[in-house]
Interface confidence: low
C-alpha cells in the first residue's frame, strides 16, 4: 500500500455572465469593486468546481480580472489529479464537466445561477502551467485591462519607474482580431515584449516575443487569432523615452481564400499572401489557394523571400507554418536564403495550397509569388537546383547549389565548348574575330541572338548575345544596344591601406569612396550611380552604427587626414542591407547607401561599372583594391588611398583554404604566398577588374578574411555578379529592407574584419 | 553502391504466410519511397505495393489488398512485405524496388533501382 | 485496376525506327504525366529508360524517346541496335497511391 501520486495541472481561463455588466472601477485592481466582485466571483467558481466531479480535485483558484462582454471573468485553477487520470482530464473534458453543470438542474440555488447568471457556451478552459501564473502573479502590480472599440487605436504606455513589467489585458469584440503594432523609435534599448493568444501570459499560447530593438522590422504588426490579447512588456533600461511605440486596434477577419487561374505565359503573375500582411500571421490562419494552370505543360513556381519549405520527419508541428500543397504535408522555416517550390501539375483540375498556422508562435507574414514554369525545360540556359527549386548558372566554376550539382559532369567549367570536339577555350576568346575551335565554332552566331545560357549576356529585351562581357565594349552587340546603355562608368580619371600596395594618384579611382563616423574613416565603397553607394553589409553591423543618420561619404578623397579641392560629401538619407546578410557566415555582405543628393561627376568622382549577372571574371585575372585600411595586419590605417593588385582564384582552390566556409556570393583574390591584400578600414572597398575596352567593372567587395595577407590565406570579397539582381532591385526602388536593415549579429571568432 | 537485397523467399502451401525483406544500402533509405513488384513465371511485371518514406502513405494492388501488408524499418534500412493467405497465383519472383530521386520529394512513381528478386513459390 | 495494354511484340532491322503503344484510361495514362517505360533483358531486374513521359535518366541512350497523346503513351527506339532485344514495360500512376503495368512488348532486332 503506497500513498496515490497526485499531479498539480494548472488551467487557465474566463466564463461570461449575463446578468451583470462591467465598469471601469473593476478594471482597477486597488478598488474596492474590483476585491468585492472578486471575492464573490471566488466563491461562485468554488462552488461551480465543487458540484463536479472536479470537486475532490480542486486545490485552489483565483479570479484575477474583469472584462466587458457583459462582464466577463478571467480565472485560473489547479487540480490535484491522480496521475493515471492525468491525461483524462484534458481542459475540452474539465470544459465538458463544468458546462454540463452549468446546464443541469442539479442544484438550482448555487450561486452560479442566483447571484451570477452563467453562459456555458462564453466558458473558456485552457491549459496553464505553475510558471504561467507566477509570470502572471508577477506582472498584477502592473495589470491594465483594456477593451478595444472598433476604429479605435489605443496606445500603451509602457511600465513607469516604479514598476519593471506589465501585463496588458486586452480585449476587442467578438467578431474581430486583435493588432498590436509595435514601432522602434530608438536604436538601443534592452526591453522585452511578449505577446499571448489569450487573456494572460500563458506559455503555450506565446504569439512571439522581441527583445532589443530590432533593425530588420522597424514596424511590427502581430495578429491575435481572436478578440483577446495579453501583452507582457519588461523593462531593461530605464529611461523617460519608451524605446518603442505599441497600439492596438481591432480589424475585421480577412478571407484568404482564393481561386486563381493562370495565364500560359513564364513571368511571375501574382502574389499570395497571409491576411494583414506583412503583419504577423494570426496563430488562426488557414488560408487556401487554388490555383489553375493552363495545361499540362506547365509546373507551378512558388518563389518565398526568406522562407522555404521542407518535410517535416515523424509528422511534428510545422513551427513556422503549415503547407499542403498536392496532399503534401511541408513545414514552412525562416532563411536568409531565397527559395522557390516547383510544383509539377500531373492533372488538370489544378493545385491547392493550404497554409495553416499549427501553434499559436507565428512569425512574419508570408508573401509568395507565383509563376510557371515549362516542365520540360524549367531552368533554359542553366540548370535546376533541386535543393531550392532555383535555376542557377551551371558549370561556371561556383557550386551554386547546396549538393554542387550544378557543377557536376561539366565538359568544359568556366569555359567554352567547342561543338566540333568538346573542346575547352577560354572564354575572353569566344566572339574575339579569332577562330579557335576546329571549324571555328567559337566565332558563329557572334552577331545574332542566341539561346541563353550561363555566359551569355541578356539583352533587355530578354533575347541573349554570345560574346561574353559585352557591356560597355564601344560595340552594339544587342539588337536594341542595350548592351552599350548606362555606360558613362568605369572610367579613370586624366592621371595615370591595403597590405602590400602602393599609394594612388588623383582620378586613378574616381569610384572610391570614404564612410565615415564623426570624421573618423571606417569603411570604404564605391559609387555605382549619381546617388548610391555600394560598400560592405558588416560594416553597420554594430547597433551603434546601424542608423544612416549618422554616416557621412566622402568622393574624391585621397588623404583622410586632409581636405582638397577635388572631394565632396554627402549625408545618407537611406541604407539598404540585403535582406539575406549573416553576420556569422558574412553571406550576403552587400549595402547600398542613398545619398542626400545627386552627385555631379567630375575627373576625381565617378562611377565604376556594375557587371551584368552573366559577367565572367576569369580565375587568374589581375584585378586591383584600394583604400584606406590598415597596411599590416594590426596595423593602423593608412592616410593616402591605397592600391594593390591580386590575382583572382578558382572557388574551389579557396574554398579548401577557408574548409568550404566561401559561398557562392563570395569571390576570392591575393596570392598562395599572401603580402598583397585588404585589411582593417578596406571592408566595402571596391575590388575592381579592367576589360580590354579599359572600362573597370566592379567584381567584389572587401568582405572577410583571416588575418591581412597571410599565406594560403586569400580575401574574400562579396561576389558583385551575384548580388547584381538585389542591387539593380533596389536601384530602380522595387525592394531591399530599407531604412534600416540588419539582423541582431554575433562575432564569428575566427575571422578578422577588413 | 546503390544496392537492394530481397531475402525471405521459398516454397509456402497455399493459405499459410511468409515475409519478405528487402535490405538497402548506399542511399538514404528514409529519403525514398519503396515498391514491391512481381513477376508470375513467364508473365509481365505486376506492380504489388507501395510505402512513402515515412510510411504515411500506402498503397496495394487490388489481387494483394487485405492478405499483404508492407512496412519499413528506416532505422535498420529494411523494406518488408508481409505476404498471409498465400494463393498459388501470388507465385512470382519478388521485386523490391526504389522510387526514383524526387528533385522537390514527390513521387515520380517510377523505380530506378531494382533488386534481384526473391522466388516464392505457393503450392500444395 | 487493370493493365495497360501494350501489343506483345515488335520488331524492327538494325538502324530503323520503332514504336511501342501503351493505352490506358482517363483515370492513368490519359489523367497523369507519370508514364514510365522499363527494359528487361532475360533473367534480368527490369531498368528504367524513360519517366515522366518523356524524360530520360542518366545513361539512357538519346535513341530512346517517349511521348503522350491522349490516353495512349508511346516509346521511341531510333537507331535500333541489337542490345536493344528486351522486353519493354510501361506503367502509369493510377491514383489513389496504386501504380499498374503494361503486359509487356517483345522487341526483336531482326537479321
Known amino acids: 500500500y503506497k500513498a496515490e501520486v497526485t499531479i498539480s495541472q494548472v488551467y487557465s481561463g474566463s466564463l461570461r455572465v449575463l446578468n451583470r455588466h462591467f465598469s471601469q472601477d473593476l478594471a482597477r485592481r486597488e478598488s474596492i469593486a474590483f476585491r468585492t466582485e472578486t471575492a464573490k466571483a471566488q466563491k461562485m467558481f468554488q462552488e461551480l468546481v465543487a458540484s463536479t466531479r472536479l470537486g475532490t480535485y480542486y486545490n485552489s483558484s483565483s479570479i484575477y480580472a474583469f472584462g466587458e462582454g457583459p462582464l466577463i471573468c478571467f480565472f485560473w485553477f489547479i487540480l490535484d489529479i491522480p496521475e493515471y487520470q492525468r491525461l483524462t482530464l484534458s481542459p475540452e473534458v474539465v470544459r465538458e464537466l463544468l458546462v454540463g453543470e452549468l446546464l443541469s438542474n442539479s442544484s438550482a440555488l448555487a450561486s452560479y445561477r442566483t447571484e451570477y447568471e452563467v453562459d456555458p457556451e462564453g466558458l473558456v478552459i485552457l491549459e496553464a502551467s505553475v510558471n504561467d501564473i507566477v509570470v502572471l502573479n508577477s506582472t498584477l502590480g502592473c495589470y491594465r485591462y483594456s477593451y478595444v472599440n472598433p476604429g479605435q487605436v489605443l496606445r500603451l504606455r509602457g511600465p513607469d519607474q516604479q514598476t519593471t513589467s506589465c501585463l496588458w489585458h486586452l480585449q476587442g469584440p467578438e467578431d474581430l482580431m486583435l493588432k498590436v503594432q509595435l514601432e522602434w523609435t530608438r536604436v538601443d534599448c534592452r526591453d522585452r515584449v511578449a505577446m499571448y493568444d489569450a487573456a494572460g501570459p500563458l506559455e503555450k499560447r506565446l504569439i512571439t516575443s522581441v527583445y532589443g530593438c530590432s533593425r530588420q522590422e522597424p514596424v511590427m504588426e502581430v495578429l491575435a487569432s481572436g478578440s483577446v490579447m495579453a501583452v507582457v512588456w519588461k523593462k531593461g533600461l530605464h529611461s523617460f523615452y519608451d524605446p518603442f511605440l505599441l497600439s492596438v486596434k481591432s480589424v475585421a477577419f480577412q478571407d484568404c481564400q482564393v481561386n486563381l487561374t493562370l495565364e500560359g505565359r513564364l513571368d511571375p503573375q501574382g502574389f499570395l499572401r497571409t491576411p494583414y500582411y506583412p503583419s504577423y500571421y494570426s496563430p488562426s490562419t488557414h488560408c487556401s489557394w487554388h490555383l489553375t494552370v493552363p495545361s499540362l505543360d506547365y509546373g507551378l513556381a512558388l518563389w518565398f523571400d526568406a522562407y522555404a519549405l521542407r518535410r517535416q520527419k515523424y509528422n511534428l508541428l510545422c513551427t513556422q507554418g503549415q503547407w499542403m500543397i498536392q496532399n503534401r504535408r511541408l513545414c514552412g522555416f525562416r532563411t536568409l536564403q531565397p527559395y522557390a517550390e516547383r510544383i509539377p501539375v500531373v492533372a488538370s483540375d489544378g493545385i491547392t495550397i493550404n497554409f495553416t498556422s499549427q501553434i499559436s508562435l507565428t512569425g512574419p507574414g508570408v508573401q509568395v509569388y507565383y509563376s510557371l514554369y515549362n516542365q520540360s525545360d524549367p531552368c533554359p540556359g542553366e540548370f535546376l537546383c533541386s535543393v531550392n527549386g532555383l535555376c542557377v548558372p551551371a558549370c561556371d566554376g561556383i557550386k551554386d547549389c547546396p549538393n554542387g550539382l550544378d557543377e557536376r559532369n561539366c565538359v568544359c567549367r568556366a569555359m567554352f565548348q567547342c561543338q566540333e570536339d568538346s573542346t575547352c577555350i577560354s572564354l575572353p576568346r569566344v566572339c574575339d574575330r579569332q577562330p579557335d575551335c576546329l571549324n571555328g565554332s567559337d566565332e558563329e552566331q557572334c552577331q545574332e541572338g542566341v539561346p541563353c545560357g550561363t555566359f551569355t549576356f541578356q539583352c533587355e529585351d530578354r533575347s541573349c548575345v554570345k560574346k561574353p562581357n559585352p557591356e560597355c565594349d564601344g560595340q552594339a552587340d544587342c539588337r536594341d544596344g542595350s548592351d552599350e546603355e548606362h555606360c558613362d562608368c568605369g572610367l579613370q580619371g586624366p592621371s595615370s591601406r591595403i597590405v602590400g600596395g602602393a599609394m594612388s594618384s588623383e582620378g586613378e579611382w574616381p569610384w572610391q569612396a570614404s564612410l565615415q563616423i564623426r570624421g573618423r574613416h571606417i569603411c570604404g565603397g564605391a559609387l555605382i550611380a549619381d546617388r548610391w553607394v555600394i560598400t560592405a553589409a558588416h560594416c553597420f553591423q554594430e547597433d551603434s552604427m546601424a542608423s544612416p543618420r549618422l554616416w557621412t561619404v566622402f568622393l574624391g578623397k585621397m588623404r583622410q587626414n586632409s581636405r582638397w579641392p577635388g572631394e565632396v560629401s554627402f549625408k545618407v538619407s537611406r541604407l539598404f542591407l540585403h535582406p539575406y546578410h549573416e553576420e556569422d557566415s558574412h553571406d550576403y555582405d552587400v549595402a547600398l547607401l542613398q545619398l542626400d543628393h545627386p552627385v555631379v561627376y567630375s575627373a576625381t568622382v565617378r562611377p565604376v561599372c556594375l557587371p551584368a549577372r552573366s559577367h565572367f571574371f576569369e580565375p587568374g585575372q589581375h584585378c586591383w583594391i584600394t583604400g584606406w585600411g590598415a597596411q599590416r595586419e594590426g596595423g593602423p590605417g593608412s592616410s593616402t588611398l591605397q592600391k594593390v593588385d591580386v590575382q583572382l582564384i578558382p572557388q574551389d582552390l579557396c574554398n579548401e583554404a577557408y574548409r568550404y566556409q566561401v559561398t557562392p556570393r563570395m569571390l576570392c583574390a591575393g596570392y598562395r604566398k599572401g603580402k598583397k591584400d585588404a585589411c582593417q578600414g578596406d571592408s566595402g572597398g571596391p575590388l575592381v577588374c579592367k576589360e580590354p575596352s579599359g572600362r573597370w567593372f566592379l567584381a567584389g567587395l572587401v568582405s572577410w578574411g583571416l588575418g591581412c595577407g597571410r599565406p594560403n590565406f586569400f580575401g574574400v570579397y562579396t561576389r558583385v555578379t551575384r548580388v547584381v539582381n538585389w542591387i539593380q532591385q533596389v536601384l530602380t526602388g522595387g525592394g531591399g529592407s530599407g531604412g534600416g536593415g540588419s539582423h541582431h549579429h554575433h562575432h564569428h571568432g575566427s575571422h578578422h574584419h577588413h | 553502391e546503390v544496392q537492394l537485397v530481397e531475402s525471405g523467399g521459398g516454397l509456402v502451401q497455399p493459405g499459410r504466410s511468409l515475409r519478405l525483406s528487402c535490405a538497402a544500402s548506399?542511399?538514404?533509405?528514409?529519403?525514398?519511397?519503396m515498391y514491391w513488384v512481381r513477376q508470375g513465371p513467364g508473365k509481365g511485371l505486376e506492380w504489388v505495393s507501395g510505402?512513402?518514406?515515412?510510411?504515411?502513405?500506402?498503397g496495394y494492388a487490388d489481387a494483394v489488398k487485405g492478405r499483404f501488408t508492407i512496412s519499413r524499418d528506416n532505422a535498420k534500412n529494411v523494406l518488408y512485405l508481409q505476404m498471409n493467405s498465400l494463393r498459388p497465383e501470388d507465385t512470382a519472383l519478388y521485386y523490391c524496388?526504389?522510387?526514383?530521386?524526387?528533385?522537390?520529394?514527390?513521387?515520380?512513381?517510377?523505380?530506378?533501382?531494382w533488386g534481384q528478386g526473391t522466388t516464392v513459390t505457393v503450392s500444395s | 485496376q487493370s493493365a495497360l495494354t501494350q501489343p506483345p511484340s515488335a520488331s524492327g532491322s538494325p538502324g530503323q525506327s520503332v514504336t511501342i503503344s501503351c493505352t490506358g484510361t482517363?483515370?492513368?495514362?490519359?489523367?497523369?504525366?507519370?508514364v514510365s517505360w522499363y527494359q528487361q533483358h532475360p533473367d534480368k531486374a527490369p531498368k528504367v529508360m524513360i519517366y515522366?513521359?518523356?524524360k530520360r535518366p542518366s545513361g539512357v541512350p538519346d535513341r530512346f524517346s517517349g511521348s503522350k497523346s491522349g490516353n495512349t503513351a508511346s516509346l521511341t527506339v531510333s537507331g535500333l541496335q541489337a542490345e536493344d532485344e528486351a522486353d519493354y514495360y510501361c506503367?502509369?500512376?493510377?491514383?489513389?497511391?496504386?501504380?499498374?503495368f503494361g503486359g509487356g512488348t517483345k522487341l526483336t532486332v531482326l537479321g
Open positions: 482517363s483515370s492513368d495514362v490519359g489523367f497523369y504525366n507519370f
Open positions: 548506399g542511399f538514404t533509405f528514409d529519403d525514398h519511397v
Open positions: 506503367s502509369s500512376y493510377a491514383g489513389s497511391n496504386k501504380v499498374v
Open positions: 510505402i512513402s518514406w515515412n510510411s504515411d502513405t500506402i
Open positions: 524496388a526504389r522510387e526514383k530521386d524526387g528533385d522537390f520529394y514527390y513521387n515520380y512513381f517510377v523505380m530506378d533501382v
Open positions: 515522366e513521359v518523356s
